[in-house]
C-alpha cells in the first residue's frame, strides 16, 4: 500500500525517525511511515526530488532553496509556544540615545546571534542586499558585510577570512576563552548575547528576535549584565527609515520569519501528509506518551525531525513556498542566496559599435586589474533588439537600454532590470517628466479629462513628450479611440485643431497643422524643424503663449526655460512661470513647480537589463565596486565608466551623464522601473501598431 518515506539527516534523527515509525505502526496510523537516511538537509531535498524520499521538515532558507530549485512545496507547518502563530519576527535593535537608522547602518558596529543564523545573519544581510543598501561583489557576502559595518561580533565567523572585522567586537567568556565561538562560551552569542553586545555598548545595532529585548530587560534577566536594563532605552529600526518602540515589532521589523515546515514533491498529496502527522501529534505530543514527537532529549540532541518548541502542527492552505515564506522573508533570501560556485566567471556585455567595443575592452581590462568579479567579456550585436535576442538566448548577459527598449526587453524578451543610471539634476534631458501645460485661467479652467475639442500644441510628431506619451496616455485612458489603428485621424478628431510639426506630411490630417505658423515669412508651415516657430518643446510652449493653443505637451523644464527672463526672445521676455499651470492625471491642476507629482509620465533613466535567472545583486555589486574606482570622471585609476570622450563617441556602455549606478530596489521588473504611467503610454501607442 501507500507509504511515506521521511528523510533523516543524521544518526540521532534516524534513530528518532525509527521510533516514530514504530510508534505510528503500533497505533495503527496509516499510511505507514518509513525512514530514509540522507547526509544533510540539501541531500534530503535531492532525494525527495528524485522520488527516493517523500518528506522532511526544513527551515525558511531551506524551504526557499527546495521550492525555487527543486519545485518542492510546504504542506505542514510548525506552531511554537510563545511565538506569533506560525512565525516570529527578525528585528534590528538600537539604543534610543543613538541616531542610527536602517539607512545609516554603513560604518556602525553590529551584533549578530551567529553566522548563518536566521535573524542574526540571513535576514538582516539578505534584506540589506536586496534593498540595495549593501552591495556584494562576486557572491562574497562575508567580505561585503565586513566592509559595510564598522566592526562586528558574528559568532562562528572566526574560521572565515574576515574574522578580524567580523569578530572584532566579540569577547569570549569571563576568562577570554572562546572568542567568536558559535557557542555559549562567547558571551555575545545567541539572541541574548547579541542584545548584550548592544546593551554593553560594544555594538550600535543588534539583529535579534522580536521578543529578545523584552525577555532581557525590566528585571527579567538574572545575569548581572541585564539587571538594570530598561526596555524603554531601546528602539527598533523600521524598513522605511523610521524607528519605533520595542513593542511595535509587528509593524516595525526586517522580516516575518516563517516557521519550519514539512515539504514534499509537488505531486504529493499534502492533505495525506497532514492527516498522518495530525494523528501522530494527537497521540504522541503530550507528556507521558510512549513516544514524544516534539522532544529530542532521549537522543542527546535538539530539534530532531521537528523543532522541540513545536506546540502543534497545522495544515498549510496555500501550498507554495512563496506564500509560506511571505514576501519579506522571500526578498531577504533573494538578497542572500548567492553561491560563489555557481556564479558565472564572466558577465558578457552587449556592445553595438566599434567605439563601444573599444571602451568595453578597456573596461574589462580595468576591472580585471582591480580583481573585480565577475570579469567582463564584450560581445557584439547589431542593434538593441539583437542584444535582447542574444541575452534571451543566453549568448550575452547584460546591456544598458533606454526606456522604450526596456519596455521591449521586458515585455517581449522577459528581461529584468539589474541596475539603473542616475543623473545630476541639471541633466534633465536624460530623465524628465512629460507635462501638459495650460494658461492659468480661472474663468475657463479645464482639466485633463476635458481636453476633447481643445486646441493642442505638440513639439513634433513622434517626439516623446510632445506626441508618444501624451497621445499614448490619452488612448490608454480611453479618451482617444483610434479606428483601424489610425492614430493620426483619431487625434485630429479629438482636438479641435493642433500643431504637430512633421517631416513627412503625406496623408497627414490637415487639422494637425492648423495651428502651425511656419517661419517669419509664413513659409515652411508645419515642417519638422526649427523653421516652424512652433516646432520643438520651446515652440509648443510658444504656441500656448501666443494663444494659438489651449494646452502644450512639453518637458517639465520647458516653462522654466522660457519664463522669468530665461529666454530673451521677444515672445518670451516678459513671461512669468506663475501664469501657467499643469494638468494632472487625477483631474486637478497644479503649479508648474509640482511637476514631480503632476505629470503624464516620467521618461525613465536607462537601466542595465539581464535575464531573470541572472543574480541582479552580483551585477549591481560589480558596478557599485567599479564606480567607486572608475565612476568619477576625474579618477586616476585609468578608466572612466561614465565618460566616452576618449573613444570619439557618446554614451558608450552607459550614458555620459550618469553620475552613479543605482540599485533597482523594489523596481525589479520592467514595469516597476519604467513606472505605470510611462508603460501605459507605451501600451496606448503599441496597441495601435497593426
Amino acid at each position: 500500500g501507500m507509504e511515506v518515506r521521511w528523510c533523516a539527516t543524521s544518526d540521532p534523527e534516524q534513530h528518532k525517525c525509527g521510533n516514530m515509525s514504530e510508534a505510528f505502526r503500533e497505533a495503527g496510523i496509516q499510511p505507514s511511515l518509513l525512514c530514509v537516511r540522507g547526509t544533510s538537509a540539501d541531500h534530503c531535498v535531492q532525494l525527495i526530488a528524485a522520488q527516493e524520499a517523500d518528506a522532511i521538515t526544513l527551515d525558511g532558507g531551506a524551504i526557499y532553496e527546495a521550492g525555487k530549485e527543486h519545485g518542492l512545496k510546504p504542506v505542514v507547518g510548525e506552531v511554537y509556544d510563545q511565538e506569533v502563530g506560525t512565525s516570529y519576527y527578525a528585528v534590528a535593535v538600537v539604543r534610543r540615545s543613538s541616531h542610527v537608522t536602517i539607512d545609516t547602518l554603513k560604518g556602525v558596529k553590529s551584533c549578530h546571534t551567529g553566522i548563518n543564523r536566521t535573524v542574526g545573519w540571513n535576514v538582516p544581510v539578505g534584506y540589506l542586499v536586496e534593498s540595495g543598501r549593501l552591495s556584494v561583489m562576486g557572491c562574497d557576502v562575508l567580505k561585503a558585510v565586513s566592509d559595510y559595518f564598522g566592526g562586528s561580533c558574528v559568532p562562528g565567523a572566526g574560521e572565515t577570512s574576515y574574522s578580524e572585522s567580523l569578530c572584532r567586537l566579540c569577547r569570549g567568556d569571563s576568562s577570554g576563552e572562546g572568542v567568536c565561538d558559535k557557542s555559549p562560551l562567547e558571551r555575545y552569542y545567541d539572541y541574548s548575547g547579541a542584545f548584550r553586545c548592544l546593551a554593553e555598548g560594544a555594538g550600535d545595532v543588534a539583529f535579534v528576535k522580536h521578543s529578545t529585548v523584552l525577555e532581557n530587560t525590566d528585571g527579567k534577566t538574572l545575569p548581572s549584565w541585564g539587571q538594570a536594563l530598561l526596555s524603554q532605552d531601546f528602539e527598533l529600526l523600521c524598513r522605511d527609515g523610521s524607528r519605533a518602540d520595542v513593542t511595535e515589532w509587528r509593524q516595525c521589523h526586517l522580516a516575518r520569519v516563517p516557521a519550519h515546515a514539512v515539504v514534499v514533491r509537488a505531486d504529493t498529496d499534502g492533505g495525506l501528509i497532514f492527516r498522518l502527522l495530525n494523528e501522530g501529534q494527537r497521540l504522541f505530543s503530550h507528556e507521558g506518551s510512549s513516544f514524544q514527537m516534539f522532544s529530542s532529549e532521549a537522543y542527546g540532541q535538539k530539534d530532531l525531525l521537528f523543532k522541540d518548541s513545536t506546540s502543534e502542527l497545522v495544515p498549510i492552505a496555500t501550498q507554495t513556498y512563496e506564500a509560506w515564506l511571505g514576501h519579506e522573508y522571500l526578498h531577504a533570501m533573494k538578497g542572500l542566496l548567492c553561491d560563489p560556485n555557481r556564479l558565472p566567471p564572466y558577465l558578457r556585455w552587449c556592445v553595438l559599435s566599434t567605439p563601444e567595443i573599444q571602451k568595453c575592452g578597456d573596461m574589462a581590462v580595468a576591472f580585471r586589474r582591480q580583481r573585480l568579479k565577475p570579469e567582463i567579456q564584450c560581445v557584439s550585436a547589431k542593434s538593441p533588439q539583437h542584444c535582447m535576442e542574444r541575452i534571451q538566448a543566453e549568448q550575452v548577459d547584460a546591456v544598458t537600454l533606454s526606456g522604450e527598449d526596456i519596455y521591449t526587453a521586458g515585455k517581449t524578451y522577459g528581461l529584468v532590470p539589474a541596475a539603473g543610471e542616475h543623473y545630476a539634476p541639471e541633466d534633465s534631458s536624460n530623465s524628465y517628466y512629460v507635462v501638459a501645460v495650460v494658461r492659468r485661467d480661472s474663468s475657463h479652467a479645464f482639466t485633463l479629462d476635458e481636453l476633447r475639442g481643445k486646441r493642442s500644441c505638440h513639439a513634433g510628431f513622434g517626439s516623446p513628450a510632445g506626441w508618444d506619451v501624451p497621445v499614448g496616455a490619452l488612448i490608454q485612458r480611453g479618451f482617444i479611440r483610434p479606428k483601424d489603428c489610425d492614430v493620426l485621424t483619431a487625434v485630429s478628431e479629438f482636438f479641435n485643431a493642433s500643431c504637430v510639426p512633421v517631416n513627412n506630411p503625406k496623408n497627414y490630417p490637415s487639422s494637425l497643422c492648423a495651428l502651425c505658423v511656419g517661419d517669419e515669412q509664413g513659409r515652411n508651415k508645419c515642417v519638422g524643424n526649427s523653421q516652424e516657430r512652433y516646432y520643438g518643446y520651446r515652440g509648443a510652449f510658444r504656441c500656448l503663449v501666443e494663444n494659438a493653443g489651449d494646452v502644450a505637451f512639453v518637458r517639465h523644464t520647458t516653462v522654466f526655460d522660457n519664463t522669468n527672463g530665461h529666454n530673451s526672445e521677444p515672445w518670451a521676455a516678459e513671461l512669468r512661470s506663475e501664469d501657467y499651470e499643469l494638468l494632472c492625471p487625477n483631474g486637478a491642476r497644479a503649479e508648474v513647480s509640482q511637476f514631480a507629482a503632476c505629470n503624464l509620465a516620467q521618461i525613465p533613466p536607462h537601466a542595465v537589463m539581464v535575464r531573470p535567472d541572472t543574480n541582479i545583486f552580483t551585477v549591481y555589486g560589480l558596478l557599485d565596486k567599479a564606480q567607486d574606482l572608475f565612476g568619477d570622471d576625474h579618477n586616476k585609476n585609468g578608466f572612466k565608466m561614465f565618460d566616452s570622450s576618449n573613444y570619439h563617441g557618446q554614451d558608450l556602455l552607459f550614458k555620459d551623464a550618469t553620475v552613479r549606478a543605482v540599485p533597482v530596489g523594489e523596481k525589479t521588473t520592467y514595469r516597476g522601473w519604467l513606472g505605470l504611467d510611462y508603460v501605459a503610454a507605451l501600451e496606448g501607442m503599441s496597441s495601435q501598431q497593426c
Epitope: 541639471e426 541633466d427 514631480a596
Partner: antibody, heavy 119, light 112 residues
Amino acid sequence: EVQLQESGPSLVKPSQTLSLTCSVTGDSITSGYWNWIRQFPGNKLEYMGYISDSGITYYNPSLKSRISITRDTSKNQYYLQLNSVTAEDTATYYCARRTLATYYAMDYWGQGTSVTVSS
Amino acid sequence: DFVMTQTPLSLPVSLGDQASISCRASQSLVHSNGNTYLHWYLQKPGQSPKLLIYRVSNRFSGVPDRFSGSGSGTDFTLKISRVEAEDLGVYFCSQSTHVPPTFGGGTKLEIK
C-alpha cells in the same frame, strides 16, 4: 517662505560619527534636491552631496566612503552622517535646497551649524 | 574636480563705486544641453551664503538690479553698479555644470 535649520552636536571626538539634521519648513523634501555643504575655517566651501526627491543620493567622491545622507519625509527632515571624523572635518555645515526654478543653484540655505572635531 | 578661480581675493571699494569680480573655470561650463550653470552667492559677515545670480545672468528674486552677471565658456564677471553698505561680504562663484558642484575661493568686498 522656505526655511532650513541645521541641528546637531557642536563638538565631536576624532574617529566618531558626525550626525546632523536639517529641518525644512515651507517646502516638502519630496520635491527638489536637498544638499549639504560645508565651509572650512578660511572660507573654502565644499559641496558634500544631496538626496533627491525620489530618495536617490549623490556624494562628492572625496567623501564617498564616509558620508551618508538620509531623510524622514514624515518629519520633513534630512540628515547627514560623516563617519571616522578627523580635525580636518572641523567646519560650519550648511543644508541647502536646489530646484529647477533657479536651475539647481542653491536658492535657500540654513543658517549653518559649527562643528569642531577635537578630543 | 573643476577648479573655480576668483580674482581679486580682496576688493576695497568706496560706497557708490562700481565693483567687478572675476571668476574663471578650469574648463568650459557650457553643458551639453546648452545651459551654463554658473551661479553667484554673497555671504555677509556671520550669515550663510545667499543666492544672488543663477545661470550666469539671472537675478534671484529680491536681488537689486544693481547686481548683474555676464560671461560665457570659462570667464564670468559679477558687477555691482553702485556699491552700498549692505553689499559688503564675501562673494562666491559656483558651477554645477560638472559634478560635483564646486565653488570659487571667494572675493571679499570691503570698504576702502
